[in-house]
């Protein structure tokens, strides 16, 4: 029961986390205009990974996409890449984990296969969460660097006496959403990995049984199913003796000590 709960909770937590990563990636408020000790403007700026926006005092908001790819800072491109990789890995992880859920029966899928898939999705969630946290942290570091640079030089000269306003930017809501979402995805991934251990059936030790065939005396030694891989060394139709001989095709699935569904 505990394993099923851990797996289910891991899935839900990861799902929320990945939804958050997607939301953060799409949000426009990665950086927002710093209102403290700045010239008071009639407009409010905020920027995302894909476009920058300006909200006027009337509430009218206008956004412009970054229509260039080569003209963008390498760091911004790196953040975009990290977030997209995080989303893709997370999405694949979700897909895999759906089939791995113990409460969902798909054909005659064995616990070993489910354990395998749970571990795979768990690792994917962990990497996805790390990608999101890394992406958001890189962007935050970029903001901090630019903030202090623009604080040191609030107004940049444009030749002669003409000056231009240097707008300073601070952390936007998307950064916090990204950090929390990345953390949740990471936690969900860890929970899936923990659940994987409980899902894996204990290794069965089969005693070697010898039987006498009409011509030769042959001892068959089974290669007990490996829980970690889900694949045994037995090939199709090789006899495995456990008291009553039957082929692998005929082996019945008995409930394990973890199976309560």
């Amino acid at each position: 029961m505990a394993v099923t709960a851990c797996q289910g909770l891991g899935f839900v937590v990861s799902l929320i986390g990945i939804a958050g990563i997607i939301a953060a990636t799409c949000m426009d408020q990665w950086s927002t205009q710093d209102l403290y000790n700045n010239p008071v403007t009639a407009v409010f700026n905020y920027q995302g990974l894909w476009r920058s926006c300006v909200r006027e005092s009337s509430g009218f908001t206008e956004c412009r996409g970054y229509f260039t790819l080569l003209g963008l800072p390498a760091m911004l491109q790196a953040v975009r890449a990290l977030m997209i990789v995080g989303i893709v890995l997370g999405a694949i992880g979700l897909l895999v984990s759906i089939f791995a859920l113990k409460c969902i029966r798909i054909g005659s899928m064995e616990d070993s296969a489910k354990a395998n898939m749970t571990l795979t999705s768990g690792i994917m969630f962990i990497v996805s969460g790390l990608c999101a946290i890394a992406g958001v942290s890189v962007f935050a570091n970029m903001l901090v660097t630019n903030f202090w640079m623009s604080t040191a030089n609030m107004y940049t000269g444009m030749g002669g006496m003409v000056q231009t306003v240097q707008t300073r930017y601070t952390f936007g809501a998307a950064l916090f959403v990204g950090w929390v979402a990345g953390g949740l995805t990471l936690i969900g991934g860890v929970m899936m990995c923990i659940a994987c251990r409980g899902l894996a059936p204990e290794e069965t030790n089969y005693k070697a049984v010898s039987y006498h065939a009409s011509g030769h005396s042959v001892a068959y030694k089974p290669g007990g199913f490996k829980a970690s891989t889900g694949f045994g060394s037995n090939t199709k139709n090789k006899k495995i003796y456990d008291g009553g001989a039957r082929t692998e095709d005929e082996v019945q699935s008995y409930p394990s000590k973890h199976d309560y569904v």
């Epitope: 407009v43 009337s58 009218f60």
Partner: antibody, heavy 119, light 113 residues
Framework: EVQLVESGGGLVQPGGSLRLSCAVS????????MHWVRQAPGKGLEWVAY????????YYADSVKGRFTVSRDNAKNSLYLQMNSLRAEDTAVYYC????????????WGQGTLVTVSS | DIVMTQSPDSLAVSLGERVTMNCKSS????????????LTWYQQKPGQPPKLLIY???TRESGVPDRFSGSGSGTDFTLTISSVQAEDVAVYYC?????????FGQGTKLEIK
């Protein structure tokens, strides 16, 4: 039709106080920021103060800071300008102006009310 | 504070003539976030309150004749009247609507010869 009607102007002695009012109609007053702009006789325009729709942002020209207070009553569709410690240089026609939806422009102006500061 | 300087102070032109007036700001009024210039032009006829002509430096307010056009970016702006009419006699003001305190130029007076 958008209408802004200023009132409360008149003759006042230096150091005195005056409260200007602006009655608004023809639009949803509570959705727009409002400005006060003045124009001394024969001179150019001078921006005085701004108050946002929800009164969260209030800004003043340096020349009136600490002496003038802008306020609004959204329920009464009214804008106010409380003027204290008046000086001769405050003599002007005071306009009540709506902040436009686009471009932070000042799109609708009242006819103005004359304030004369003289002894 | 941003200082707005208009030139010339006054000009007299003949009817149908093309006229341009300039406005220069001490700081850039360009907003990179939306690629807009926060400069506005007003027309004030004698005995009347000012009237909004152009916002965002080049966008005509609805109801304004298309002979009026605005241009420029950053710190240098121009108001052009392609063919002056008798009713265009007025004082024209530019205004910084980007940084508080909002500031006006001293005005350009347009007269007919």
């Amino acid at each position: 039709e958008v209408q802004l009607v200023e009132s409360g102007g008149g003759l006042v002695q230096p150091g005195g106080s005056l409260r200007l009012s602006c009655a608004v109609s023809g639009f949803t007053f509570s959705s727009f920021g409002m400005h006060w702009v003045r124009q001394a006789p024969g001179k150019g325009l001078e921006w005085v103060a701004y108050i946002s729709s929800g009164t969260t942002n209030i800004y003043y020209a340096d020349s009136v800071k600490g002496r003038f207070t802008v306020s609004r009553d959204n329920a009464k569709n009214s804008l106010y300008l409380q003027m204290n410690s008046l000086r001769a240089e405050d003599t002007a026609v005071y306009y009540c102006v709506r902040s436009g939806y686009y471009g932070s422009s000042l799109d609708y102006w009242g006819q103005g009310t004359l304030v004369t500061v003289s002894s | 504070d941003i200082v707005m300087t208009q030139s010339p102070d006054s000009l007299a032109v003949s009817l149908g003539e093309r006229v341009t007036m300039n406005c220069k700001s001490s700081q850039s009024l360009f907003q990179s976030g939306n690629q807009r210039n926060y400069l506005t032009w007003y027309q004030q006829k004698p005995g009347q309150p000012p009237k909004l002509l152009i916002y965002w430096a080049s966008t005509r307010e609805s109801g304004v004749p298309d002979r009026f056009s605005g241009s420029g970016s950053g710190t240098d702006f121009t108001l052009t009247i392609s063919s002056v009419q008798a009713e265009d006699v007025a004082v024209y003001y530019c205004q910084n609507v980007y940084i508080y305190p909002l500031t006006f130029g001293q005005g350009t007076k347009l007269e007919i010869k």
